[in-house]
């Protein structure tokens, strides 16, 4: 007795397609071993037609596939364009040879059933309408015209020319003639349902001289389109319902036994399970729209249906489109935190995954807004300037090649709480959703800048200090100058005539940035932050205003010549710690590659460092350095 299970008998008709599901026991070996579909010959040999190793026989070319669903312990063989030659005995099985575990399946493909010779076949989709053409002889022009539906015993009236209408066709059936043509009448039936399928007879006149025509109306449910998506990825349902429903409300629902639960519609309804990760986008005036769901979960798998109706809810007899969504748990998309927590005044660093094969793609970050149909306006991108209201507090750091980019948002307020999406202009499956929660701060921030009201004087030296706690002792500290194109990390060394530097005071764990001399271009936002390798941590921001020295004032330069010499000396110490190897430029520099990671003087273990020059618009540059402070007890 084989542990493989499937349909023992499958029957279909020529031209149709079948989906044969085979079930296998839940073991790791079974999930990963070869799956096959073979045809049994008279000799008892079973000839492979298709296998999960990629083999496809000539007779199945272009019309069959085999898909494994390891999470369901099933695999499915889909065969299209069936002919009577496909009738026969088959096996679905597992194993490296066709003598492994298997199950016998008998497939019978029969001819399309014969209808009376004069039968006209109309094939329509559910929810659509049909116009049945009924020809008659001129002598029956004055006679009654009718359409009836055949039942087992009789023919039940649908509509006739005396305006009699069957109750189940009221408002849906119309009998009419076109122009002056007195040899044909028409019956239009709208909002077709499965119950409308069957044989009809249209008739003009009575008795033996009556004109009759047989009609076979086939009402088809749309075949669900199969969608295979990875866990945590995104899916787009493209719904094309036709111009006749262009002005109706649209919806997407998920089948739940006998009902279809609306997930989203254009009237503002949205299932809370999809909060922050769904958008509905009307495409055009032809009834087309799309629904995008990001951050796919295992429980999102299922049977989906889109449709249109003024109520925004599923209604029988209205056009629909369907999908079967499978969510593969063996995902290529890394498992990241879906909720990030911050505090007011603080900062968050959000790591956004992208397809590592598309390192040159443009990266974006948008904020999901649920009003209306939902939308996600871009706040920042690799080539998109930061939105004005986020000035000085939002930046995107692209780390080419490692499959992650980082978005940092600081000066948080409770208004920042909500859902954000990471997306690129490349592989759309890699759209991910982050929920940002912002709580009221209950303690001082980890990073603090002094002075807090920073006004630098043109031509002088200006120093700001960033205080950090001992827990950031082993992390790299950096200063960067924010612009709406990003936050350019200041290089740790510059021997240009204009000197600026960052130094670290041993006793009080601080990293300082000195602008020397201050120029007008120095005005703007600066961030102090910590990072470990490519992982960014907390940041804090300060705005430095630059003003001219008021004439005649006896302004005292904050750093005298001795202090300036001291800074230079400290820089020399920093420089002496950079080995030849560490001075190599970053390969394949991206927009933020002009970053010199901060040197930690006093560290016993030298970490691998990279450097590069960050030129500002006028060719001047800023520099930053940092030291670890060892406390001896």
């Amino acid at each position: 007795k084989s542990p493989i299970f499937g349909p023992q008998e499958v029957s279909s008709i020529e031209g149709d397609s079948v989906s044969i599901t085979c079930y296998y026991p839940d073991t790791s070996v079974n999930r990963h071993t070869r799956k096959y579909w073979c045809r049994q010959g008279a000799s008892g040999m079973c000839t492979t037609l298709i296998s999960s190793n990629g083999y496809l026989s000539k007779e199945y070319s272009g019309r069959a596939n085999l898909i494994n669903f390891p999470e369901n312990n099933t695999f499915v063989i889909n065969i299209e364009q069936l002919t009577q030659d496909d009738t026969g005995s088959y096996k679905c099985g597992l194993g490296t040879s066709n003598r492994g575990l298997s199950f016998d399946v008998s497939l019978e493909v029969s001819q399309v059933p014969e209808l009376p010779s004069d039968t006209h076949v109309y094939t329509k989709d559910i929810g659509r309408n049909v116009t049945i053409e009924c020809p008659f002889k001129r002598e029956n022009a004055p006679s009654k015209k009718s359409l009836c539906k055949k039942t087992n015993q009789s023919c039940e009236l649908v509509i006739d020319s005396t305006e009699k209408v069957n109750p189940s066709y009221i408002g849906r059936a119309k009998l009419f003639m076109k122009g002056t043509d007195l040899t044909v009448f028409y019956v239009n039936i709208s909002h077709l349902t499965h119950n409308d399928a069957g044989l009809y007879i249209c008739q003009a006149g009575e008795g033996p001289s009556a004109d009759k025509k047989n009609v076979d109306l086939q009402v088809l449910a749309p075949e669900p389109e199969l969608l295979y998506k990875d866990l945590r990825s995104s899916v787009t349902f493209e719904c094309d319902l036709g111009r006749e429903v262009a002005n109706e409300a649209k919806y997407l629902c998920r089948m739940n036994k006998e009902t279809c639960d609306v997930i989203i519609n254009t009237l503002g309804k949205r299932d809370p399970d999809f909060e922050g990760r769904i958008l509905i986008t009307p495409k055009d005036d032809n009834g087309r729209f799309s629904v995008l769901i990001t951050g796919l979960r295992k429980e999102d798998a299922g049977h989906y249906q889109c449709g249109a109706h003024s109520s925004g809810l599923p209604q029988e007899g209205w056009p629909i489109q369907t999908w079967q969504l499978f969510v593969n748990e063996e995902s290529t998309i890394p498992n990241r935190r879906s909720v990030v927590k911050g505090v007011t005044g603080g900062s968050v660093a959000i790591a956004c995954p992208y397809n590592p094969k598309e390192s040159s793609s443009l990266k974006y970050w948008c904020r999901w807004e649920g009003d209306g149909n939902g939308h996600c306006p871009v706040l920042v991108g690799t080539q998109a300037q930061v939105q004005e209201e986020y000035e000085g507090r939002l930046a995107l750091f692209d780390q080419p090649g490692n499959g992650t980019y980082t978005v940092i948002l600081n000066q948080l307020t409770t208004e920042d709480a909500g859902f954000y999406w990471c997306l690129t202009n490349g592989d759309s499956r890699w759209r991910t959703t982050i929920e940002l929660q912002v709580a009221e701060a209950t303690r001082e921030p980890n990073l603090e800048v002094t002075p807090q009201n920073a006004t630098a004087v043109l031509g002088e030296t200006f120093t700001v200090s960033c205080h950090y706690p001992c827990k950031f002792y082993s992390q790299e500290k950096y200063w960067c100058k924010w612009s709406n194109k990003g936050c350019h990390i200041l290089p740790s060394h510059d021997e240009g005539a204009r000197q600026s530097s960052v130094s670290c005071d041993q006793s009080s764990q601080l990293v300082s940035m000195t602008l020397n001399p201050v120029s007008k271009e120095d005005e703007g936002w600066y961030w102090c932050g910590v990072k470990q390798g490519q992982t960014y941590g907390e940041t804090t921001a300060i705005y430095i205003a630059v003003e001219e020295r008021t004439r005649g004032s006896s302004h005292v330069n904050p750093t005298d010549a001795n202090a300036r010499a001291k800074v230079a000396l400290e820089e020399e110490v920093v420089d002496s710690s950079i080995s030849e190897k560490e001075n190599k430029a970053i390969p394949n520099p991206g927009p933020f590659a002009n970053e010199r990671e901060i040197q930690n003087v006093g560290d016993q273990a030298q970490e691998n460092r990279a450097s590069g020059d960050a030129g500002s618009a006028d060719g001047q540059s800023r520099s930053s350095s940092s030291k670890h402070h060892h406390h001896h007890h």
Partner: nanobody, 129 residues
Framework: EVQLVESGGGLVQAGGSLRLSCAAS????????MGWFRQAPGKEREFVAA??????????YYAESVKGRFAISRDNAKTTAYLQMGSLNPEDTALYYC????????????????????WGQGTLVTVSS
């Protein structure tokens, strides 16, 4: 709401045959599944056979223990399923339940009761030796 009513059960001698019917009312399915399960006294409910249809396709599933002896079918009006049982033996004695659903995800094991939403009350089949 769909109602399922089983009929055709009764007492039969070993080696004999019976034909069970399951009539569905309340709604017709353009695609769907109807199955038969059975439960012998003191035992768990077990799968017997199922028939699934969609468009012009029909898929018939059987439990190993009834293969070659039982045959499942349905009428074209899509409202009644039949289970033709032959070569009956005392181990076939049980309460036979009919179950149905609009096409469930065909990636769920149809031998489990879970995919079936609608159930009948059952009809008793007793096979005497």
């Amino acid at each position: 709401e769909v109602q399922l009513v089983e009929s055709g059960g009764g007492l039969v001698q070993a080696g004999g045959s019976l034909r069970l019917s399951c009539a569905a009312s309340g709604r017709t399915f353009s695609s769907g599944i109807m199955g038969w399960f059975r439960q012998a006294p003191g035992k768990e409910r077990e799968f017997v056979a199922a028939i699934e249809w969609s468009g012009g396709n029909t898929y018939k599933y059987y439990a190993e223990s009834v293969k070659g002896r039982f045959a499942i079918s349905r009428d074209n009006a899509k409202t009644t399923a039949y289970l033709q049982m032959g070569s009956l033996n005392p181990e076939d004695t049980a309460l036979y339940y009919c179950a149905a659903d609009e096409s469930p995800s065909r990636y769920i094991d149809l031998r489990r009761p879970a995919p079936y939403h609608y159930w009948g009350q059952g009809t008793l089949v007793t096979v005497s030796s």
